[in-house]
C-alpha cells in the first residue's frame, strides 16, 4: 500500500497567533528570507525497496539533488558511518566502487544517483539493522546524509510489487514560475528590509505548532509560514521503523517502500549529532544544518526541476518531494 501526503494549501495565519495585519507583514520577510536562503540547498533522497521476485533481496537507491559535483558516496546500515553504522558500499565517480557483504551490486545509475542490491539471506540479513544511510560528499556543498528504513519481515502472500510513483514532469512554465516568484520575493524582501531598516524589530510570539523546537520560533511564527518554508521532510513508508526514524503515516498500513528526501545533517556529523536529531511525527519538516525545526501538517509543494535523474520508468518515489530551485 502506498501512502501519499497531500500538497498543503496555504492558509492565512490565525489571528490569535499573529494579531494585527502589521504583524503579518513582518512574517513575510522571514518566510521570503528562508526561501531565498534554502532555495539552492542540496537534498539527499534514500529509497529502499524489497524485490518482489526475490523476497530476500533489497534495493537501496540514493540520489543527490544539488548543483555540486559528487566526490564520494557512502552507503551504510545501522546508522551513519561515523556513528556506529557499517559501510555497505563506497562509490567514487573516478576511482571506482567498493562494497561489503551483504551488498551484492553497487552501481551508479546517473551522475548523481546510485543503487545497491542487498542479499537478504544468512546471518547478515538486511533487517538485522533496518536503517540505511547514504552520504554524499560533494563540492562545494560539503557532506550530506539521509537515511531510510526497510521492513522487518516480508509477507510472501503479497506477490505484486509496490507501484512506484510516476516520475515528476517539471515543465518549463513551472520552473520559471517558481524562479520568478523567488526572484520577486527576494527583491521584495530587500525592499522591505530597506524600508524597515531603522525600525526596531518587534518580538515575535512563539509558535504553538512547533513545541519540539524552540529554536524554530523566531523563524516559523505561523502554520502558514511554516508550510511555505522550503525545508526538508521525512517520509518513511514502511512498517518496520527503527527508533531513530519513527515517522507516522497518514493512512497507515504496511508498504515495501521507504523514501526519504532530506537535507539531512551537514558535516561535522558524529554520534551526538545523529542521536540528538529529533525526527518529529507525521509530515514534519526537519532541517538539521541550519538549526531550523518547523513542523507543519503536510508536504510543501513540488518546486524543482532536477527531474531527469532517473530515466528509468520505475524512477524513485523520492522524486515526489520538494526538490528546490537550483
Amino acid at each position: 500500500m502506498r501512502t501519499e501526503a497531500q500538497v498543503p494549501a496555504l492558509q492565512p495565519p490565525e489571528p490569535g497567533l499573529e494579531g494585527a495585519m502589521g504583524h503579518r507583514t513582518l512574517v513575510l520577510p522571514w518566510v521570503l528570507l528562508t526561501l531565498c536562503v534554502t532555495a539552492g540547498t542540496p537534498e539527499v533522497w534514500v529509497q529502499v525497496r524489497m524485490e518482489a521476485t526475490e523476497l530476500s533481496s533489497f534495493t537501496i537507491r540514493c540520489g543527490f539533488l544539488g548543483s555540486g559535483s559528487i566526490s564520494l558516496v557512502t552507503v551504510s546500515w545501522g546508522g551513519p558511518n561515523g556513528a556506529g553504522g557499517t559501510t555497505l558500499a563506497v562509490l567514487h565517480p573516478e576511482r571506482g566502487i567498493r562494497q561489503w557483504a551483504p551488498a551484492r551490486q553497487a552501481r551508479w545509475e546517473t551522475q548523481s544517483s546510485i543503487s545497491l542490491i542487498l542479499e537478504g539471506s544468512g546471518a547478515s540479513s538486511p533487517c538485522a539493522n533496518t536503517t540505511f544511510c547514504c552520504k554524499f560528499a560533494s563540492f562545494p556543498e560539503g557532506s550530506w546524509e539521509a537515511c531510510g528504513s526497510l521492513p522487518p519481515s516480508s509477507d510472501p502472500g503479497l506477490s505484486a510489487p509496490p507501484t512506484p510513483a510516476p516520475i515528476l514532469r517539471a515543465d518549463l512554465a513551472g520552473i520559471l514560475g517558481v524562479s520568478g516568484v523567488l526572484l520577486f520575493g527576494c527583491v521584495y524582501l530587500l525592499h522591505l528590509l530597506r524600508r524597515h531598516k531603522h525600525r526596531p524589530a518587534p518580538r515575535l510570539q512563539p509558535s504553538r505548532t512547533s513545541p519540539q523546537a524552540p529554536r524554530a520560533r523566531a523563524w516559523a511564527p505561523s502554520q502558514a509560514s511554516q508550510a511555505a518554508l522550503h525545508v526538508p521532510y521525512a517520509t518513511i513508508n514502511t512498517s518496520c521503523r527503527p527508533a531513530t526514524l519513527d515517522t507516522a503515516h497518514p493512512h497507515g498500513g504496511p508498504s515495501w517502500w521507504a523514501s526519504l528526501p532530506t537535507h539531512a545533517a551537514h558535516r561535522p556529523q558524529g554520534p551526538a549529532a545523529w542521536a540528538s536529531t529529533p525526527i518529529p511525527a507525521r509530515g514534519s519538516f526537519v532541517s538539521v544544518e541550519n538549526g531550523l525545526y518547523a513542523q507543519a501538517g503536510e508536504r510543501p509543494p513540488h518546486t524543482g526541476p532536477g527531474l531527469t535523474l532517473f530515466p528509468d520508468p520505475r524512477g524513485p518515489r523520492a522524486m515526489e518531494g520538494p526538490l528546490g530551485v537550483r
Epitope: T87, G96, I97, A101, R104
Partner: antibody, heavy 114, light 106 residues
Framework: EVQLQQSGPELVKPGASVKISCKAS????????MNWVKQSHGKSLEWIGD????????NFNQKFKGKATLTIDKSSSTTYMELRSLTSEDSAVYYC???????WGQGTTLTVSS | DIVMTQSQKFMSTTVGDRVSITCKAS??????VAWYQQKPGQSPKLLIY???NRYTGVPDRFTGSGSGTDFTLTISNMQSEDLADYFC????????FGGGTKLEIK
C-alpha cells in the same frame, strides 16, 4: 600527490610478532578505508583485510583472522598491521592500499627466519 | 569464498598484438571486478574497475569487459612496456585476486 609510505623491511624470528605501518599523505585518511595485501614470493596477491578509519571497524579474509590485527591512528594518518605467531609461511611482501586499490604503498618485506 | 581463476598463467605475445586475458569467478559477482598490472619490483597498478571502467591515466589500449562470472582484459596494441603480471580481483564479497597472468615476449 597521494602517497602511502610503508615502514622498512623486517627480519624476525619464528613465533615473534611484527607491526608494519602505512602513513597516508596527500589525502584525508578518514575518508577512505585502508586495505592490506600479502604477496608471497613469485605468487599472487592475497587480500588480508581492511579497516574503516571512521570507527576502526575491520573486515578480514577468513584465512588471516587471528593472524593479523589492523589499527589506525587518525592523528598521524597512519594505519598499522600487526602479525603474530610468525612462521616462515608469513614471509612475504605486504602492501597497504587505499580503499579503491588505486594507491599502493611501496611494500614492506617481511622475512621470518631463525 | 569467491574464487577468481585466471587459467592462463603465462601468455606469449609480440608488440602490436591484440592480447586477451581472461578471468572466471566461482559465482556471480556482477561487475564488481578490477584489473591490475604489476611489473617486477613494483607495486600493483589499477587499470580497470567495475569490469569495464578505465582508471584515470590508463592508456585506452586497455579495455575491460564482462559481467557475472566471465571477465576479460584486452590490450589492443601490445607495447613492450605492457610486459607485466596482470591480476583480476573481485570485490562483490570481500576481495579476492586471481592467480595472475604473466605476459612474455615470444
Amino acid at each position: 600527490e597521494v602517497q602511502l609510505q610503508q615502514s622498512g623491511p623486517e627480519l624476525v624470528k619464528p613465533g615473534a610478532s611484527v607491526k608494519i605501518s602505512c602513513k597516508a599523505s596527500g589525502y584525508t585518511l578518514t575518508d577512505y578505508y585502508m586495505n592490506w595485501v600479502k604477496q608471497s614470493h613469485g605468487k599472487s596477491l592475497e587480500w588480508i583485510g581492511d579497516i574503516n578509519p571512521n570507527n576502526g571497524g575491520t573486515n578480514f579474509n577468513q584465512k588471516f583472522k587471528g593472524k593479523a590485527t589492523l589499527t589506525i591512528d587518525k592523528s598521524s594518518s597512519t594505519t598499522y598491521m600487526e602479525l603474530r605467531s610468525l612462521t616462515s609461511e608469513d614471509s612475504a611482501v605486504y602492501y597497504c592500499a587505499s580503499l579503491f586499490f588505486d594507491y599502493w604503498g611501496q611494500g614492506t618485506t617481511l622475512t621470518v627466519s631463525s | 569464498d569467491i574464487v577468481m581463476t585466471q587459467s592462463q598463467k603465462f601468455m606469449s605475445t609480440t608488440v602490436g598484438d591484440r592480447v586477451s586475458i581472461t578471468c572466471k569467478a566461482s559465482q556471480n559477482v556482477g561487475t564488481a571486478v578490477a584489473w591490475y598490472q604489476q611489473k617486477p619490483g613494483q607495486s600493483p597498478k589499477l587499470l580497470i574497475y567495475s569490469a569495464s571502467n578505465r582508471y584515470t591515466g590508463v592508456p585506452d589500449r586497455f579495455t575491460g569487459s564482462g559481467s557475472g562470472t566471465d571477465f576479460t582484459l584486452t590490450i589492443s596494441n601490445m607495447q613492450s612496456e605492457d610486459l607485466a603480471d596482470y591480476f583480476c580481483q573481485q570485490y562483490s564479497s570481500y576481495r579476492t585476486f586471481g592467480g595472475g597472468t604473466k605476459l612474455e615476449i615470444k
